[in-house]
């Protein structure tokens, strides 16, 4: 069987990474620190009332490339930043909400002329 790091992409880190977690701490976290084979992240998004909420934590290697790509989601303002350069590197990530577009002010199928 292949050992860690010998498999095909995505390439596993040779060692576990520790990240700060907030509002996103898994059961195996301790003292707001989680562990991962992937990335640390910090994310900002609007809740249902439009209030910005910051969460941070760990992303596993599987699928994290996609999750860390900050692809816009229609009708949802959010931004995510990921890092791997050191333990708890996400303490220093400060993503900001993308600016409101005109259409974000409008509900339903009403369009500006």
């Amino acid at each position: 069987k292949k050992e860690d790091g010998e498999s095909t992409a995505p390439t596993a880190r040779p060692k576990v990474l520790r990240c700060k977690c907030h509002h996103h701490c898994p059961e195996d976290s301790v003292n707001n620190i989680c562990s991962t084979d992937g990335y640390c992240f910090t994310m900002i998004e609007e809740d249902d009332s439009g209030t910005p909420v910051v969460t941070s934590g760990c992303l596993g290697l599987e699928g994290s490339d996609f999750q860390c790509r900050d692809t816009p989601i229609p009708h949802q303002r959010r931004s995510i930043e990921c890092c791997t350069e050191r333990n708890e590197c996400n303490k220093d990530l400060h993503p900001t909400l993308p600016p409101l577009k005109d259409r974000d002010f409008v509900d339903g199928p009403i369009h500006h002329k």
Epitope: K15, S35, N87
Partner: antibody, heavy 116, light 112 residues
Framework: QVQLQQPGAELVKPGASVKLSCKAS????????MQWVKQRPGQGLEWIGE????????LYNQKFKGKATLTVDTSSSTAYMQLSSLTSEDSAVYFC?????????WGQGTTLTVSS | DVVMTQTPLSLPVSLGDQASISCRSS???????????LHWYLQKPGQSPKLLIY???NRFSGVPDRFSGSGSGTDFTLKISRVEAEDLGVYFC?????????FGSGTKLEIK
């Protein structure tokens, strides 16, 4: 090949401190965590804590906080564990071990004897 | 802390026999990444432990294929298909899913 060299034995007096060393070779020192494990005669293994040599980030077993302090010297690829306020309960074999997601390689261990 | 319970404490075997060691954890060892960080080590008298099996069932480099690991969640087993003299010693299971990492109390494999 991976080697973790530890002194064979240390004899210290109660109340004193000791700094145990672990010299790593055969791999990139900063690419793996270094863990420390305690084994008392005829007893099991106890995890003390770990240090990431790339940023000196440490995690400790709550039980050993205040007792053990982990440090590294990356220039010599050496990890250290200082044990303070020693008592007979600290007499044990102390292993350093290379850790990625599990302990892959262990040092031979240092036998610490605390005695007046 | 996660308690690792190993059985039996002592396992007398004849050379060539199959040996089986059980390890139970007090909570699930499935990590949030999906990996299960349960490992097996062998410690011979006067030596440091050596890694045999990592992440439940993966043999470490140089470990003979007579060693195999299985299990999931909280129940794990190490099997030695045909015990050889060099296999004698104390076997420990260990988990690195939850901090602090913990070890089983050990199973002593000895000649009957």
């Amino acid at each position: 090949q991976v080697q973790l060299q530890q002194p064979g034995a240390e004899l210290v007096k109660p109340g004193a401190s000791v700094k145990l060393s672990c010299k790593a070779s055969g791999y990139t020192f900063t690419s793996y965590w270094m863990q420390w494990v305690k084994q008392r005669p005829g007893q099991g293994l106890e995890w003390i804590g770990e240090i990431d040599p790339s940023d000196s980030y440490t995690l400790y077993n709550q039980k050993f906080k205040g007792k053990a302090t982990l440090t590294v010297d990356t220039s010599s690829s050496t990890a250290y564990m200082q044990l303070s306020s020693l008592t007979s309960e600290d007499s044990a074999v102390y292993f350093c071990a290379r850790f990625g997601y599990y302990i892959e390689y262990w040092g031979q261990g240092t036998t610490l004897t605390v005695s007046s | 802390d996660v308690v690792m319970t190993q059985t039996p404490l002592s396992l007398p075997v004849s050379l060539g026999d199959q040996a089986s060691i059980s390890c139970r954890s007090s909570q699930s060892l499935v990590h949030s990444t999906g990996n299960t960080y349960l490992h097996w080590y062998l410690q011979k008298p006067g030596q440091s432990p050596k890694l045999l099996i990592y992440k439940v069932s993966n043999r470490f480099s140089g470990v003979p294929d007579r060693f195999s690991g299985s299990g999931s969640g909280t129940d794990f087993t190490l099997k030695i298909s045909r015990v050889e003299a060099e296999d004698l010693g104390v076997y420990f299971c260990s988990q690195s899913t939850h901090v602090p990492f913990t070890f089983g109390s050990g199973t002593k494999l000895e000649i009957k």
